[in-house]
């Protein structure tokens, strides 16, 4: 039975040209995390494999940095980066947990972080 929950940074906003950290945290389970995948819609951004370390998608090397931790840093943001991002935790023996983050990239200099929320 999957007992864990993923806590994410939720709905967040950031300034065009700036950077943002996407973070997820898996709690309430003793399952072992074998890999975390980061996706934007259906595009792979990066993989953090417990044995092999980070793989950054070549398509995003110029604008994505690994970390901190299992998180992902997006740099040089553009309005086109607005949208859904997913952290996909592959665990043993539980299986797969998915967290969702919505990022809005603003032209304005006023960009505030949304509240944290949980996805069961």
């Amino acid at each position: 039975m999957m007992t864990g929950t993923i806590e994410t940074t939720g709905n967040i906003s950031a300034e065009k040209g700036g950077s943002i950290i996407l973070q997820c945290h898996l709690s309430s389970t003793t399952a072992q995390v074998t890999q975390v995948n980061w996706e934007q819609q259906d595009q792979l951004l990066a993989i953090c494999n417990a044995d092999l370390g980070w793989h950054i998608s070549p398509s995003f090397k110029d604008r994505v940095a690994p970390g901190p931790g299992l998180g992902l840093t997006l740099q040089s943001l553009t309005v086109n980066d607005t949208g859904e991002y997913f952290c996909i935790y592959h665990t043993y023996p539980d299986g797969t947990y998915t967290g969702r983050i919505f990022l809005e990239v603003l032209e304005s200099s006023v960009a505030e972080h949304g509240a944290r929320f949980q996805i069961p």
Epitope: D51, L52, W54, P58, K61
Partner: antibody, heavy 117, light 113 residues
Framework: QVQLVQSGAEVKKPGASVKVSCKAS????????IHWVRQAPGQGLEWIGD????????NYNEKFRGRVTLTADTSTSTVYMELSSLTSEDTAVYYC??????????WGQGTTVTVSS | DIVMTQSPDSLAVSLGERATINCKSS????????????LAWFQQKPGQPPKLLIY???TRESGVPDRFSGSGSGTDFTLTISSLQAEDLAVYYC?????????FGAGTKLELK
């Protein structure tokens, strides 16, 4: 030990399709990307595309997009490359290679595909 | 696409002498986050698949003799064989794996002088 074993040589007519297999062993199949590279007779190396068996991710060289399809069967640790609408310019040795982040470290023995009428 | 330009096209070297092959990339291959250049060197002998020699521009693959070394960063790279052995006669390719599509140099044929 890590091994990538490819299917045997193929002879095809122009306009036909070919499907080449690459069976992996000696490592965790779903952890690594498999890339495909081809080499025409007496020529250099040309990247075709890659696939990640641990997910639904694949990438293609625009030159081959629409003509090539990469698939993976995790139950048999095998990756397939299918190339359609073959012409004589597709005559080449086709290689699969394992990759994560540091380089293509292990290669298959190669599969010769000959396109001739 | 990133263009990889190798020089020379062919190189004749005496046994025991040094061989140097150059590779220039049309774009920067250095990833700021880990300060690694995504450049590999391969050796290919007739009828065989390419063999990985060097990755991240300067890291020698396990089992590769230490007479092979790679250097450079960003856009300019060099493969050096410090003392040529008969078994080193082959074609050498550089490859970038920084961005899609991955691309190779045209190759350098290493021959005996």
């Amino acid at each position: 030990q890590v091994q990538l074993v490819q299917s045997g040589a193929e002879v095809k007519k122009p306009g036909a399709s070919v499907k080449v297999s690459c069976k992996a062993s000696g490592y965790t199949f779903t952890n690594y990307w498999i890339h495909w590279v081809r080499q025409a007779p007496g020529q250099g190396l040309e990247w075709i595309g890659d696939i990640y068996p641990g997910g639904r991710y694949s990438n293609y060289n625009e030159k081959f997009r629409g003509r090539v399809t990469l698939t993976a069967d995790t139950s048999t640790s095998t990756v397939y490359m299918e190339l359609s609408s073959l012409t004589s310019e597709d005559t080449a040795v086709y290689y699969c290679a394992r990759y994560y982040e540091s380089a293509m470290d292990f290669w298959g023995q190669g599969t010769t595909v000959t396109v001739s009428s | 696409d990133i263009v990889m330009t190798q020089s020379p096209d062919s190189l004749a070297v005496s046994l025991g002498e040094r061989a140097t092959i150059n590779c220039k990339s049309s774009q920067n291959l250095l990833y700021n986050s880990n300060q690694k250049s995504y450049l590999a060197w391969f050796q290919q002998k007739p009828g065989q698949p390419p063999k990985l020699l060097i990755y991240w521009a300067s890291t020698r693959e396990s089992g590769v003799p230490d007479r092979f070394s790679g250097s450079g960063s960003g856009t300019d790279f060099t493969l050096t064989i410090s003392s040529l052995q008969a078994e080193d006669l082959a074609v050498y390719y550089c490859q970038q794996y920084y961005n899609y599509p991955f691309t190779f140099g045209a190759g350098t044929k290493l021959e005996l002088k």
